[in-house]
């Protein structure tokens, strides 16, 4: 096996590796620097193995996964001592890498010449005492939103940043104005942002106006 | 900062046996796979022995396969190895050694001397 | 068992130099390779890990490449306190295997 990649957003975790078999089989391991591995995929002649399982139980550990080939009779894809060949992922820790996948911008209200934006959020398959986390559950202050906002009339963006799901911003009276929010974490040093979220604009069904 | 401190080498007889031991700070220990690494006098590096972090997993170099233990006790942070039936060749430092996935060695200790004589 | 050869068994440079140790495993390991270095009467220290991947707070000066069977570890520019004996190690399958040592003395 070769190209093996982490694909991963939001915890959700799957290793990626080439080539398509062809008489052979491949089964995957993963473990923490503990070396304590534990066999997933067994046999597969997938060529992508679903690890969320296993990097959930503590996301800021960092895991190594490796791709064993079993030959159905072709001795070459077995070392001298006829154990299978094997090839490691790149180390991966889910905590300062898994990507952030695109936000929703939940709700907008507003009173008078304010404005509350509400980012929803998202559920990750993370668990704690049987309880699915959020996103801001795991993260906590390390994660921020930043909110793109501007007047429908113009071109001219205004942002603003929380580090909680709720922005609360000043706008003119009577001017509607669009929305797009994004994740970012910035202590981190690769994928520190997600997608800019859909946009939304007021007058459309997610907003409430109250005098 | 990561400290690996070596103890229990000494002196013994041929057929003696022995008990080093590792105690480990600076770092989640369990977290870790650790091994034994020994250095004759005047020689190379040799792997002797590691263990997985929950201990479930060990492995031997086969010169000492039946006569060493490798354990450990994640409460106290500390690394063994049993040496038993022990020869005038176990004669080395021996180095306890921190080793992710129970691949290569990224921190050591100073090292311990046994010495099997009669 | 995987047989590492290294060479050369010794080397003599001067501070400054450009210096490549090499490293033959007897069967393919992939990247499965560390170095390490080691002073007299001093512990091993860690260099590289998977082949060319540098440990936390070693100098840029060290690197490492090869996959397979042919490994080398170079120093771009020797300091003095470079020098000292330098080990390969596979990881490939149990049992590890270390190279026999390669000193690097002061010419």
């Known amino acids: 096996a070769f190209n093996l990649t982490w694909i991963s957003t939001d915890f959700k975790t799957i290793l990626e590796w080439q080539p398509k078999p062809t008489n052979y089989t491949y089964t995957v391991q993963i473990s923490t620097k503990s070396g304590d591995w534990k066999s997933k995929c067994f046999y597969t002649t997938d060529t992508e193995c679903d690890l969320t399982d296993e990097i959930v139980k503590d996301v800021k550990q960092t895991y190594l996964a490796r791709v064993f080939s079993y030959p159905a009779g072709n001795v070459e894809s077995t070392g001298s001592a006829g154990e299978p060949l094997y090839e490691n992922s790149p180390e991966f820790t889910p905590y300062l890498e898994t990507n952030l996948g695109q936000p929703t911008i939940q709700s907008f209200e507003q009173v008078g010449t304010k404005v509350n934006v509400t980012v929803e959020d998202e559920r990750t398959l993370v668990r704690r005492n049987n309880t699915f986390l959020s996103l801001r559950d795991v993260f906590g202050k390390d994660l921020i939103y930043t909110l793109y906002y501007w007047k429908s009339s113009s071109s001219g963006k205004k942002t603003a940043k929380t580090n909680t799901n709720e922005f609360l911003i000043d706008v003119d009276k009577g001017e509607n104005y669009c929305f797009s929010v994004q994740a970012v974490i910035p202590s981190r040093t690769v994928n520190r942002k997600s997608t800019d979220s859909p946009v939304e604009c007021m007058g459309q069904e997610k907003g409430e106006f109250r005098e | 900062e990561v400290q690996l401190l070596e103890s229990g080498g000494g002196l013994v007889q041929p057929g003696g046996s022995l008990r080093l031991s590792c105690a480990a700070s600076?770092?989640?220990?369990?977290?870790?796979?650790m091994s034994w690494v020994r250095q004759a006098p005047g020689k190379g590096l040799e792997w002797v022995s590691s263990?997985?972090?929950?201990?479930?997993?060990?492995y031997y170099t086969d010169s000492v396969k039946g006569r060493f233990t490798i354990s450990r006790d994640n409460s106290k942070n500390t690394l063994y190895l049993q040496m038993n039936s022990l020869r005038a060749e176990d004669t080395a430092v021996y180095y306890c050694?921190?080793?992710?996935?129970?691949?290569?060695?990224?921190?050591w200790g100073q090292g311990t001397l046994v010495t099997v004589s009669s | 068992d995987i047989q590492m050869t290294q060479s050369p068994p010794s080397l003599s440079a001067s501070a400054g130099d450009r210096v490549t140790i090499t490293c033959r495993a007897s069967?393919?390991?992939?990247?499965?390779l560390a170095w390490y270095q080691q002073k007299p009467e001093k512990a091993p220290k860690s260099l590289i890990y998977?082949?060319?991947s540098l440990q936390s707070g070693v100098p840029s000066r060290f690197s490492g490449s090869g996959s397979g069977t042919d490994f080398t570890l170079t120093i771009s520019s020797l300091q003095p306190e470079d020098f000292a004996t330098y080990y390969c190690?596979?990881?490939?399958?149990?049992?590890?295997?270390f190279g026999q040592g390669t000193k690097l003395e002061i010419k």
């Open positions: 263990i997985s972090g929950s201990g479930d997993y060990t």
């Open positions: 190690q596979q990881y490939n399958s149990y049992p590890y295997t």
């Open positions: 069967q393919g390991i992939s990247s499965r």
């Open positions: 600076g770092f989640t220990f369990s977290n870790y796979a």
């Open positions: 998977a082949a060319s």
């Open positions: 050694a921190r080793s992710p996935w129970g691949y290569y060695l990224d921190s």
